[in-house]
């Protein structure tokens, strides 16, 4: 029985050109995490394998950095990066847990209604 839950950073609104950290945390289970996949829609961004370490997809190498931890750092954000990101935890013996984060990237000139943009 799958007892675990995934906590995420929550949805994020950020400025074009900035960078953000996407993070998920698996709790309430003793299952062993064998691999974490990070995906956007149907595209694989990165894999963190318990034995083999990190692999960043070639098309994202310039703008995606591993970590912190099992998280992912997205840099040089563009409006086209707007969308849903998935952290997919492969565990044994539980199976797969998925977390979801929506990232909204806004033009730098847009500071609508005084929104506080996140640029770490």
């Amino acid at each position: 029985m799958m007892t675990g839950t995934i906590e995420t950073t929550g949805n994020i609104s950020a400025e074009k050109g900035g960078s953000i950290i996407l993070q998920c945390h698996l709790s309430s289970t003793t299952a062993q995490v064998t691999q974490v996949n990070w995906e956007q829609q149907d595209q694989l961004l990165a894999i963190c394998n318990a034995d083999l370490g990190w692999h960043i997809s070639p098309s994202f190498k310039d703008r995606v950095a591993p970590g912190p931890g099992l998280g992912l750092t997205l840099q040089s954000l563009t409006v086209n990066d707007t969308g849903e990101y998935f952290c997919i935890y492969h565990t044994y013996p539980d199976g797969t847990y998925t977390g979801r984060i929506f990232l909204e990237v806004l033009e730098s000139s847009v500071a609508e209604h005084g929104a506080r943009f996140q640029i770490p």
Partner: antibody
Framework: EVQLQQSGPELVKPGASLKISCKAS????????MNWVKQSHGKNLEWIGL????????SYNQKFQGKATLTVDKSSNTTYMELLSLTSEDSAVYYC????????????WGQGTSVTVSS | DVVVTQTPLSLPVSFGDQVSISCRSS???????????LSWYLHKPGQSPQLLIY???NRFSGVPDRFSGSGSGTDFTLKISTIKPEDLGMYYC?????????FGGGTKLEIK
């Protein structure tokens, strides 16, 4: 002036599919997400999902995955929601609503489309 | 999914009253950067819902200052300082911090 004009009321048979439209005007269409919300029985509101016209990115409430499909036609500033395999549970008023940039809220709403599923 | 609980379900009022509506979430609505995406809406009969408050406490354009929002973490409140006839209807809070976005069950503001 921001306006969202939705298609008219629909009476459809169980098992059928239906496409509702939401035509936007008065703002830069591609720069804002468009959300869809269901209101059943005159009370509770449920978020179905959203689409970002700029790149076509979508996000769905998993409850509606396989039930609703969101698409966009940038040339006509129109967002569509297709509802599949309709049952009486899908009878409701459906709203499109523009996303408020930077705040994950909805600032302007369409007038709603009433859908009745009945044989 | 994040569960959003609104109280009370029904709120009988007299014009001129001050009222509060509570909205509680099953987990914190602050994201990892400290931003909280909690908004309030009024849905009047025969109309579309309208945005009142976004980001906990920001009044949307054209919303009278008798409406105010407050709170943090998991507990949020909408206050209406002097009830007017046009304020009657269903009030909903919405959390947009976690996927999927979820609404509270609604509070019906009606005349005593």
């Amino acid at each position: 002036e921001v306006q969202l004009q939705q298609s008219g009321p629909e009476l459809v048979k169980p098992g059928a599919s239906l496409k509702i439209s939401c035509k936007a005007s008065g703002y830069s269409f591609t720069g804002y997400t468009m959300n869809w919300v269901k209101q059943s029985h005159g009370k509770n509101l449920e978020w179905i999902g959203l689409i970002f016209p700029y790149n076509g990115a979508t996000s769905y409430n998993q409850k509606f995955q396989g039930k609703a499909t969101l698409t966009v036609d940038k040339s006509s500033n129109t967002t569509y929601m297709e509802l599949l395999s309709l049952t009486s549970e899908d009878s409701a008023v459906y709203y499109c609503a523009r996303g408020l940039r930077g705040y994950f809220a909805m600032d302007y709403w369409g007038q709603g489309t009433s859908v009745t599923v009945s044989s | 999914d994040v569960v959003v609980t609104q109280t009370p379900l029904s709120l009988p009022v007299s014009f001129g009253d001050q009222v509060s509506i509570s909205c509680r979430s099953s987990q914190s609505l602050a994201n990892s950067y400290g931003n909280t995406y909690l908004s309030w809406y009024l849905h009047k009969p025969g109309q579309s819902p309208q945005l009142l408050i976004y980001g906990i406490s920001n009044r949307f354009s054209g919303v009278p200052d008798r409406f105010s929002g407050s709170g943090s973490g998991t507990d949020f409140t909408l206050k209406i300082s002097t009830i007017k006839p046009e304020d009657l209807g269903m009030y909903y809070c919405l959390q947009g911090t976690h996927q999927p976005w979820t609404f509270g069950g609604g509070t019906k503001l009606e005349i005593k």
